[in-house]
């Protein structure tokens, strides 16, 4: 009896079970009652991922560097092209097709988590004692200067900009 | 016990016609494809034909193609091989094989066709 | 068209020894490759298929190896009856093609 359905690794075709493709082979012909599966490797800068009965292979990615874009990882036979982004962008998206610069934390926020190729810039508000006066893509919010540490009495308050102002303690006569 | 068994075979002169037929038994016939391969005296194995276990595929050797034609009737358990055309290098012991897992499992004793003026 | 090329064309031996016979394929086949052993006067039988997949009935002293374009028959120790030609075919693309046989004989 014909099967109707296949192992593993294997397809119905004319009522026959042929076996796949292995990754980084593309389909030539299905097989027979008296031949196998007939399959070629893909060729230069393209791939098959997958046990496959694909009749052409995929290309490989093509990492742009008018995107912004550059080579992460370079493809296989069996594997694609992995793009990243150049230093100071980061990936638009998960698949990576486009860049933008990395976000800078404006002044009263600083960097909670630094940039990567595949994510932005995570800001988050300086909490009270602390401060940021720039705006940056690596500075933390910063703790305001003790001016009790130093013998010193705060003159200024600071805010989430600013830093406190200390000056000398008023001397009693 | 599975059997082939081939006959037609004999002595035909250059451009003449032969028919061989390979009579099979002992399993289910239908099931399996049969290949037609043939051994010149004293050389190797060559592949001359194949045909599918329904009938509707045929496969040969571009030395063959266009001479010979394969075919079967699976009602009599039956396989042929119409040869036109003959060439004094189609003198061989002809033999019929069984495709079993694409290989030829079983395999008749043969017959001699002969093309000689 | 695949071409198998089979070394050595002969093979010399005494019962008892190992015989190792070769099978090189043209271009990568996996292991779509059968061997046959063929005694004067008659057919083919088939020994050894997919390369390395043994048959029943067929002795144990009988193994093949190899993938690829490489292929090797052995037969472990030679009895008697075992001295005839070897073929091996590949099935992996039309046409089917046999190498051109190994004869091992008695020396």
């Known amino acids: 009896e014909p099967p109707t359905a296949c192992r593993e690794k294997q397809y119905l075709i004319n009522s026959q079970c042929c076996s796949l493709c292995q990754p980084g082979q593309k389909l030539v012909s299905d097989c027979t009652e008296f031949t196998e599966t007939e399959c070629l490797p893909c060729g230069e800068s393209e791939f098959l991922d997958t046990w496959n009965r694909e009749t052409h292979c995929h290309q490989h990615k093509y990492c742009d560097p008018n995107l912004g874009l550059r080579v992460q990882q370079k493809g296989t036979s069996e594997t694609d092209t992995i793009c990243t982004c150049e230093e100071g962008w980061h990936c638009t998206s998960e698949a990576c097709e486009s860049c933008v610069l990395h976000r800078s934390c404006s002044p009263g926020f600083g960097v909670k988590q630094i940039a990567t190729g595949v994510s932005d810039t995570i800001c988050e508000p300086c909490p009270v004692g602390f401060f940021s006066n720039v705006s940056s893509a690596f500075e933390k919010c910063h703790p305001w200067t003790s001016c009790e540490t130093k013998d010193l009495v705060v003159q200024q308050a600071g805010t989430n900009k600013t830093d406190v102002v200390c000056g000398p303690q008023d001397r009693l006569r | 016990e599975v059997q082939l068994v081939e006959s037609g075979g004999g002595l035909v002169k250059p451009g003449g016609s032969l028919r061989l037929s390979c009579a099979a038994s002992g399993f289910t016939f239908s099931n399996y494809g049969i290949s037609w391969v043939r051994q010149a005296p004293g050389k190797g194995l060559e592949w001359v034909a194949s045909i599918s276990s329904g009938g509707d595929n045929t496969y040969y050797p571009d030395n063959v193609k266009g001479r010979f034609t394969i075919s079967r009737d699976n009602a009599k358990n039956s396989l042929y091989l119409q040869m036109n055309s003959l060439r004094a290098e189609d003198t061989a012991v002809y033999y019929c094989a069984r495709a079993g897992e694409k290989a030829m499992d079983y395999w008749g004793q043969g017959t001699l066709v002969t093309v000689s003026s | 068209e695949i071409v198998l090329t089979q070394s050595p064309a002969t093979l010399s031996l005494s019962p008892g020894e190992r015989a190792t016979l070769s099978c090189r394929a043209s271009?990568?086949?996996?292991?779509?490759l059968h061997w046959y052993q063929q005694k004067p006067g008659q057919a083919p039988r088939l020994l050894i298929y997919?390369?390395?997949q043994s048959i029943s009935g067929i002795p144990a002293r009988f193994s093949g190896s190899g993938s690829g374009t490489d292929f090797t028959l052995t037969i472990s120790s030679l009895e008697p009856e075992d001295f005839a030609v070897y073929y091996c075919?590949?099935?992996?693309?039309?046409?089917?093609?046999f190498g051109g046989g190994t004869k091992v004989e008695i020396k």
């Open positions: 271009q990568t086949i996996n292991n779509n």
């Open positions: 075919q590949q099935f992996s693309s039309w046409p089917l093609t």
């Open positions: 997919y390369a390395s």
